[in-house]
Interface confidence: low
């Protein structure tokens, strides 16, 4: 008797790996024998398509080598003209072992910047991505994160981030490892040990010592009063990314010697500088006999800080006092860019008035030191936090503790304005404005409108300025 088709084995979901065989079975009972057709995502599968094999009168559909594009809904439809056509559907889920489609590459990056190591993956189920640094799994922290794409992002790259990395893509079917790549961290040139200032006798030998580090290891050049060093011998050694340069000089005249450490990052250079003075003993008389002269300040760095047409002391222990003293303030100035808005104007005033001291003309031109109270105001009121940080760095050897004109004076060694009001200079920038204590009045005269409170005297310390950094 004629019998309408009945599908006795409904289609089920089939999981298959790429390049494996996948088979759907659609068992049909009917009389006469039905015609069975197959569709994928509602598109008819053609009998002559060589990627498929259709057997058992159409009841078995075999995909001979599964591709990831074969994912979808497969349906069989049976019809023998008796009753209506019947249909059963099932899904093919193409499973795929993890595959790294965009592996990481070697990266060179400057310390402090952001590094991204790519690692794009494919796979089903979607692989999870982790990273290995050296031999250990990489643990994410506040600087390091694995992005949703699988890429590794490192914020504020540090030297210790350098090393060998590989990404690992993992799902239930397997694990894929990328090739090992190298993250190289380059570091701006930095001076570890700056040359120290010397006061020597005429005709003696002096060795200036400058140590710098960076990645790549920097080169060191020496400058004498703004020009390349013309005499003297230089000895250099490099060990553990630290370059050590010694300049030996035969002293016949005073000078300002600058050590410049430079290294290259791609097309750019980074530079660190530190200066030292070499003065000749007879030229360095006690304060009252200081060799020098009074002149109007004509520089640029301090023109907003010093009084208009200020008469400043220019020290002739330098071959070119104006240029040398200007270079000293210039070197220190950049360091002040990072201090707090409260500290900065006070520190700038102290720096400029210390390097370009007020000058008393008279028969012997005499520099007038800053009053102790103003120095203490900077140290303990305006710049307490910064001063403490600098002292800490000095103790740890990151700065020199004594660097002639570049150190702000030891407050305790300065004269007090209560001893002799004319023997020391005041810093008008630090005088309080009663209406708004945080404002600094414009520079009009070198006499304060209100006395700075007599702050307690403190142990001696020096406010050293570290070398400046620049990219050229």
């Amino acid at each position: 008797l004629p019998k309408a088709p009945v599908i006795t084995t409904p289609l089920e979901t089939v999981d298959a790996l790429v390049e494996e065989v996948a088979t759907f079975m659609c068992a049909v009972e009917s009389y006469p024998q039905p015609e069975i057709s197959w569709t994928r995502n509602k598109i008819l599968i053609k009998l002559f398509d060589t990627r498929y094999s259709i057997r058992e009168n159409g009841q078995l559909l075999t995909i001979l080598s599964v591709e990831d594009s074969d994912d979808g809904i497969y349906c069989c439809t049976a019809n023998n003209g008796v009753g209506g056509a019947v249909e059963s559907c099932g899904a093919l889920q193409v499973k795929m072992k993890p595959k790294i489609t965009r592996p990481p590459i070697n990266v060179k990056i400057i310390e402090g910047l952001k590094a991204v190591l790519p690692c794009t993956t494919m796979g089903n189920p979607k692989p999870s991505v982790s990273w290995i640094k050296g031999d250990s799994p990489l643990r994410e922290n506040s600087r390091t994160a694995v992005l949703e794409s699988g890429s590794l992002r490192i914020h504020n790259v540090q030297k210790e981030d350098a090393g060998q990395y590989r990404c690992v893509a993992k799902n239930s079917l397997g694990t894929a490892y990328s090739k090992v790549v190298k993250l190289e961290v380059e570091v701006f040139a930095r001076i570890l040990r700056a040359p120290e200032s010397h006061n020597v006798t005429f005709g003696s030998f002096v060795t200036l010592h400058c140590t710098a580090t960076g990645i790549p290891v920097p080169t060191i050049t020496w400058i004498e009063n703004g020009n390349a060093v013309s005499s003297g011998s230089i000895q250099e050694s490099v060990k553990d990314r630290v370059i050590d340069s010694r300049l030996q000089l035969f002293i016949t005249k005073p000078g300002l010697y600058t050590c410049i450490a430079t290294n290259k990052h791609g097309e750019k250079f980074s530079t660190a500088k530190a200066a030292a003075t070499v003065s000749i003993a007879e030229w360095s008389k006690p304060q009252k006999d200081n060799k020098g002269y009074c002149a109007q300040y004509r520089g640029e760095v301090c023109n907003a800080v010093l009084a208009k047409d200020a008469l400043v002391f220019l020290n002739t222990s330098y071959a070119d006092p104006e240029e040398a003293q200007e270079l000293l303030v210039h070197t220190a100035w950049n360091e002040l860019k990072v201090v707090s808005p409260l500290c900065r104007p006070a520190a700038e005033a102290l720096l400029c008035n210390h390097v370009f001291q007020e000058c008393s003309p008279g028969v012997v031109p005499t520099p007038i030191p800053i009053c102790r109270e103003y120095c203490l105001a900077v140290k303990e009121l305006f710049c307490a936090k910064e001063w403490l940080a600098m002292e800490e760095k000095t103790h740890r050897g990151l700065y020199r503790s004594e660097m002639h004109l570049l150190s702000v004076p030891e407050c305790s060694k300065l004269p007090s304005m209560h001893w002799d009001p004319t023997a020391c200079a005041r810093l008008p920038h630090l005088d309080y404005n009663k209406e708004n204590p945080k404002t600094f009045p414009p520079m009009t005269s070198s006499k304060p409108s209100v006395d700075i409170p007599n702050l307690p005297s403190s142990s001696s310390s020096s406010f050293s300025v570290s070398p400046t950094y620049s990219m050229t």
Epitope: R139, E140, S142, A145, V146
Partner: antibody, heavy 121, light 113 residues
């Protein structure tokens, strides 16, 4: 401002269940791992459970495995701790804490104020 | 399960320096344990101080520093302040395959005399 606010604590009998919630705000919740940490009265901190940013895996202290379930709903910016078969030794203030990165085990850089769970008959 | 050990209590004078340690009952603490340090004052939630051995969390004063010394993790407070009186907990990451753990020490009660 980053905030983590726990709720769902209370008194429950031994063998009972509670579900703690932690509502997060002020940061990209779905970019950070989260944890539950507890502190029994007068005692120290004890890590309980952790979950990474995407909820892809879960981790538990041995003594709560099989009884507690950590989960998260990134759309609702909420972390959960389902606690079943509670014992008297589970009595503690339960803190929800944010991890410093996406993983389950970054340092705990932000904490809620805690919710007290008391298991007693 | 590993036990993380800390001094039950320590005291320090204001302005003084004190070092709290964090050890393992079996074996040494290494950088692979990523030692983290937390501070808790009475009635408050804990606060993160140091993560991954020696990195300071933002807003944590520079007087707090972390290190690994010998076979222990250490938290050093240089120039202790009265407000530093609190309980301090270290936590170590123990990762072995899928069996990961984050174990707190018993805490050190620090008194600033």
């Amino acid at each position: 401002e980053l905030q983590l606010v726990e709720s769902g604590g209370g008194l429950v009998q031994p063998g009972g269940s509670l579900r703690l919630s932690c509502a997060a705000s002020g940061f990209t919740f779905d970019d950070y791992g989260m944890s539950w940490v507890r502190q029994a009265p007068g005692k120290g901190l004890e890590w309980v459970s952790a979950i990474p940013w995407n909820g892809g895996s879960t981790y538990y202290k041995e003594s709560v495995k099989g009884r507690f379930t950590i989960s998260r709903d990134n759309a609702k910016k909420t972390l959960y701790l389902q606690m079943n078969s509670l014992k008297s030794e589970d009595t503690a203030v339960y803190y929800c804490a944010k991890r410093s990165g996406r993983i389950a085990f970054g340092a705990l850089d932000a904490w809620g104020q805690g919710t007290l769970v008391t298991v007693s008959s | 399960q590993a036990v993380v050990t800390q001094e039950p209590s320590l005291s320090v004078s204001p302005g003084g320096t004190v070092t709290l340690t964090c050890g393992l009952s079996s074996g040494s603490v290494t950088s692979s344990n990523y030692p983290d340090w937390y501070q808790q004052t009475p009635g408050q939630a804990p606060r993160a101080l140091i993560y991954s051995t020696n990195s300071r969390h933002s807003g944590v004063p520079s007087r707090f520093s972390g290190s690994i010394s010998g076979n222990k993790a250490a938290l050093t407070i240089t120039g202790a302040q009265p407000e530093d009186e609190a309980d301090y907990y270290c936590a170590l990451y123990m990762g072995r395959g899928s069996n990961k753990d984050y174990v707190f020490g018993g805490g050190t009660k620090l008194t600033v005399l």
